[in-house]
Amino acid sequence: ITCPPPMSVEHADIWVKSYSLYSRERYICNSGFKRKAGTSSLTECVLNKATNVAHWTTPSLKCIRDPALVHQRPAPPSTVTTAGVTPQPESLSPSGKEPAASSPSSNNTAATTAAIVPGSQLMPSKSPSTGTTEISSHESSHGTPSQTTAKNWELTASASHQPPGVYPQGHSDTT
């Protein structure tokens, strides 16, 4: 049993190293953002015993604009800034400190995501993210994914093709 792809967290990325049950991964806030105190970037692949389906736990992570970086790199409206990360310690459950996360390899500017309509030609239109996008992790790999997304999409005849499949969202650890 393995987990589906991870859900998205606004202004954060994740690169999953293992989709195995009980594996733990960490989201990292994009550049220009920092982890809000008291929130956790950790997610774990766990089993829902009732359904026997694995899913990623929802991290409590909130990435907020880093005031220290605002004067250096102001983000234009309706873009999402991304790139290096200011590592921040965060507490683990019951005791101890989480190690500071390593910087992902992202850079800055407009975040767009790909719409998921099997067999369609789709072009994402850039618009500001307004919240965490979470996608159901209990779909079949070939069904139409159910996705709640705060992004606007327009169909065009000449855009990129989205292959059918499940499209949940999710840092990157450079190797």
Epitope: D13, W15, T109, A114, P124, Q169, G170, S172
Partner: nanobody, 124 residues
Framework: EVQLVESGGGLVQAGGSLRLSCAAS????????IGWFRQAPGKEREGVAC????????HYVDSVKGRFTISSDSADNTVYLQMNSLKPEDTAVYYC?????????????????WGQGTQVTVSS
């Protein structure tokens, strides 16, 4: 028109090698993250490897580390996935995907463009 086209898939014996190519047209890879994903029958799609062209950083899922290598050739706007020591469990349709001006992520919906996929079958 933006297109990503994968090639290089095929049937190979366990222990063999393949090199997948992802060729882009309609845009350049200057500041893109290009990810390779795979989907085996009845399984979820998973991120296999990713490269950020602006800084050359690479990322791999644990199950392919040391066996697969992702690389990019900006001259011909192509990203490659060299797959060595292939195992039957690597059998899947392999897709490449591009994400504009942002880093690598395993979040599928974060990618702007996707290719149609290429079948890789590893026989035992």
């Amino acid at each position: 028109e933006v297109q990503l086209v994968e090639s290089g898939g095929g049937l190979v014996q366990a222990g063999g090698s393949l090199r997948l190519s992802c060729a882009a047209s309609g845009f350049t890879f200057d500041d893109y993250a290009i990810g390779w994903f795979r989907q085996a029958p009845g399984k979820e799609r998973e991120g296999v490897a990713c490269i950020r062209n602006s800084d050359g950083s690479t990322h791999y899922v644990d199950s392919v580390k040391g066996r697969f290598t992702i690389s990019s050739d900006s001259a011909d706007n192509t990203v490659y996935l060299q797959m060595n020591s292939l195992k039957p469990e690597d059998t899947a349709v392999y897709y490449c995907a591009a994400r504009v001006r942002l880093g690598c992520t395993s979040v599928l919906a974060a990618y702007d463009y996707w290719g149609q996929g290429t079948q890789v079958t590893v026989s035992s």
